[in-house]
């Protein structure tokens, strides 16, 4: 749907341009007006919508927390993309936190995967090759690799 500006005397703020809904839905980057007659644009850098919708309000842009880096900014059609800083990762089980990667594997295990923003280091038993997951081992048990950075809460 092409966005059409209203007549100058009716025009709203630049970030609030209006168009008409198509079959009751507004395009990405917009939300629907209270009376359902208009599509109102989201505010760049503040909120967004990603799909055709009948939402009364655009969604708030995520703000990257300390301990995260911003990979891409929020636009009217896409949320901010944040990533854990080097040496930390975000688990599926606790997506609100960037956790510190382990610095090494327990005794009798060997590292087969590095710390990434999405996963801790991966350790396997030397003999069996089976994976190990769990808490960071005690210092005296570790075979050190690259050091991690402190974890910070993530939004």
């Amino acid at each position: 749907i092409t966005q059409q500006d209203l007549a100058p005397q009716q025009r709203v703020a630049p970030q609030q341009k209006r168009s008409s809904p198509s079959e009751g839905l507004c395009p990405p980057g917009h939300h629907i007006s209270e009376d359902g007659r208009d599509c109102i644009s989201c505010k760049y850098g503040q909120d967004y919508s990603t799909h055709w919708n009948d939402l009364l309000f655009c969604l708030r842009c995520t703000r990257c927390d300390s301990g995260e880096v911003e990979l891409s900014p929020c636009t009217t059609t896409r949320n901010t993309v944040c990533q854990c800083e080097e040496g930390t990762f975000r688990e599926e089980d606790s997506p609100e936190m960037c956790r510190k990667c382990r610095t090494g594997c327990p005794r009798g295990m060997v590292k087969v995967g590095d710390c990434t923003p999405w996963s801790d280091i991966e350790c396997v038993h030397k003999e069996s090759g089976t994976k190990h997951s769990g808490e960071a081992p005690a210092v005296e048990e570790t075979v050190t690799s690259s050091p991690g950075t402190p974890a910070s809460p993530c939004s």
């Epitope: 909120d47 919708n53 009948d54 009364l56 309000f57 969604l59 708030r60």
Partner: nanobody, 124 residues
């Protein structure tokens, strides 16, 4: 995760006023749109009012326009519903809800959280 607790309900005479509060726990309160819904005895739950994450945009169902006002204080993690010129037909349990947004029909979008409700009774 957000926990919501409503308060401020009670018995009031027609024409009177009440102010409902909804206190939220959780540091992400300001990320959510907030809504008030109500359910009268034997009836479906009804969308009453909502406002966006900043408080800058509001929505009201026609039956409460000009009488009810929704507002929020992000510093206090609280959303309010000021109800004036109450009518017997406003009698219901009032629920507070948090979601990414709400559809025109009141359907929550994204993760949604609900309080247990507070009873408002308007006598004639």
């Amino acid at each position: 995760e957000v926990q919501l607790v409503e308060s401020g309900g009670g018995l009031v005479q027609a024409g009177g006023s009440l102010r409902l509060s909804c206190a939220a726990s959780g540091r992400t309160f300001s990320n959510y749109a907030m809504g008030w819904f109500r359910q009268a005895p034997g009836k479906e739950r009804e969308f009453v009012a909502a406002l966006n994450w900043s408080g800058g945009s509001t929505y009201y169902v026609d039956s409460v326009k000009g009488r009810f006002t929704i507002s929020r204080d992000n510093a206090k993690n609280t959303v309010y519903l000021q109800m004036n010129s109450l009518k017997p037909e406003d009698t219901a349990v009032y629920y507070c809800a948090a979601a990414g947004s709400f559809s025109l029909g009141g359907r929550p979008y994204g993760d949604d959280y609900w309080g247990k409700g507070t009873l408002v009774t308007v006598s004639s």
